[in-house]
C-alpha cells in the first residue's frame, strides 16, 4: 500500500494513466465529469467509449451484442478507473507485465452496483471474472472453450457479485448510499462537484 502522503489526488502507475492528475478539457462524453482534475488523457477517454479499443483490446460483445444500457456501465467503469484521482486509498502494488499498480476493494456505492446489475440483466457473458481466463488468440478476448454464454444473472446472481467479482475484487459493494461521503460513486453530476474527493479524504484519514 502507498504511504499516507500519497493517498490523495494521485494517479495509478498503470497502462494509460498520467503521472499526476491535472485538468483535461477535452474528456469525452461519459468521462467528462473528471475534466477538472483527471488521471486520463482526452484520447484515453475517447477510446473508453469504443468496442475493442486500443486500451485493452477488450470485447464487450463476447456473447452477442451487449445492450447499450449495459455497455454504458462498462464505459463508466473504464472512465472511473482511467480518470479518477480519488482511488489512492485502494491502490496496491502488483507484479503484472502491463501495470505496476491496481485498485483493490474500492467501496462502490450500493446504488451504482444495483443499477449496473439491473441494466445488464438482458446481456450475456460466459465468465464471472473478466480479468483472466479468456482466449486472446484472435487479438481480443473470446470465451474460452467450455464456457457457455448465459444472461449476466447466471454468472452474477447479485449486484454484489457483479461488482466484486468481475474485476478480481477491484470493487466491493459498500453498505453506504450515494451522497453519504463513505462510498465511491461511479456516476456523478459534474455540476455538483466530484463527491469522491470527500470519500478519498475520509478513507485516507481512516487508514492513517
Amino acid at each position: 500500500a502507498r504511504p499516507r502522503t500519497e493517498l490523495l489526488n494521485v494517479c495509478m502507475d498503470a497502462k494509460h494513466h498520467k503521472e499526476k492528475p491535472s485538468p483535461e478539457d477535452g474528456l469525452h462524453k461519459q468521462c467528462s465529469p473528471w475534466k477538472k482534475n483527471s488521471c486520463c488523457f482526452a484520447n484515453t477517454s475517447r477510446e473508453a467509449h469504443k468496442d475493442i479499443s486500443y486500451l485493452y483490446r477488450f470485447n464487450w460483445n463476447h456473447c452477442g451484442s451487449m445492450t447499450p444500457a449495459c455497455k454504458k456501465h462498462f464505459i463508466q467503469d473504464t472512465c472511473l478507473y482511467e480518470c479518477s484521482p480519488n482511488l489512492g486509498p485502494w491502490i496496491q502494488e502488483v507484479n503484472q507485465s502491463w501495470r505496476k499498480e491496481r485498485i483493490l476493494h474500492v467501496p462502490l456505492c450500493k446504488e451504482d452496483c444495483e443499477q449496473w446489475w439491473q441494466d445488464c440483466r438482458t446481456s450475456y457473458t460466459c465468465k464471472s471474472n473478466w480479468h483472466k481466463g479468456w482466449n486472446w488468440t484472435s487479438g481480443y478476448n473470446q470465451c474460452p472453450e467450455g464456457a457457455a454464454c448465459h444472461p449476466f444473472h447466471f454468472y452474477f446472481p447479485t449486484s454484489a457479485a457483479l461488482c466484486s467479482e468481475i474485476w478480481s475484487h477491484s470493487y466491493k459493494v459498500s453498505n453506504y448510499s450515494r451522497g453519504s461521503g463513505r462510498c465511491i460513486q461511479m456516476w456523478f453530476d459534474p455540476a455538483q462537484g466530484n463527491p469522491n474527493e470527500e470519500v478519498a479524504r475520509f478513507y485516507a484519514r481512516a487508514m492513517s
Partner: nanobody
C-alpha cells in the same frame, strides 16, 4: 413553484394495461430524477419505478424498477413536454393503489430512485384499480 400533475388512472381488468402521465411545470432544474410511487390502503408508500434524465455524461437516461413490476411496467420521458410516463401492462389486483409522481434535482440511481425520502416535490396522485 414546482407542480406535478398525474393523470391516466382508472379501473381495469386483471391482465389489462394503463398509461399514467406526470406533467411537470415550474421545475428550475434541467437534470431531474423522477419516480412513480404507490400506496394501497393501510400500506406504506412504495417505489415502483424511477428515471434520471441525465445527459451526455450519463449516456442518456437511467431507469430502475421495483422487483414486483420488472418486465411489466416501463417508465419513460418526453423532455419536450416535461412529462414522465408509466406504462403498466399485465396488471394484477395487487397493483391497485393510489399512484404518485415525485421529483428531485438529485442524481439518483438504483434503489435510490425508489426511496420516497429522496424526493422533495410530489403530485396529488391518480387512482388505479385492478379487478379480477
Amino acid at each position: 413553484q414546482v407542480q406535478l400533475v398525474e393523470s391516466g388512472g382508472g379501473s381495469v381488468q386483471a391482465g389489462g394495461s394503463l398509461r399514467l402521465s406526470c406533467a411537470a411545470s415550474g421545475y428550475p432544474y434541467h437534470r431531474v430524477s423522477m419516480g412513480w410511487f404507490r400506496q394501497a390502503p393501510g400500506k406504506e408508500r412504495e417505489g415502483v419505478a424511477g428515471i434520471y434524465t441525465g445527459g451526455l455524461y450519463t449516456g442518456g437516461s437511467m431507469t430502475y424498477y421495483a422487483d414486483s413490476v420488472k418486465g411489466r411496467f416501463t417508465i419513460s420521458q418526453d423532455n419536450a413536454r416535461n412529462t414522465v410516463y408509466l406504462q403498466m401492462n399485465s396488471l394484477k389486483p395487487e397493483d391497485t393503489a393510489m399512484y404518485y409522481c415525485a421529483a428531485t434535482p438529485q442524481f439518483l440511481i438504483g434503489s435510490g430512485l425508489l426511496r420516497p425520502d429522496k424526493y422533495n416535490s410530489w403530485g396529488q396522485g391518480t387512482q388505479v384499480t385492478v379487478s379480477s
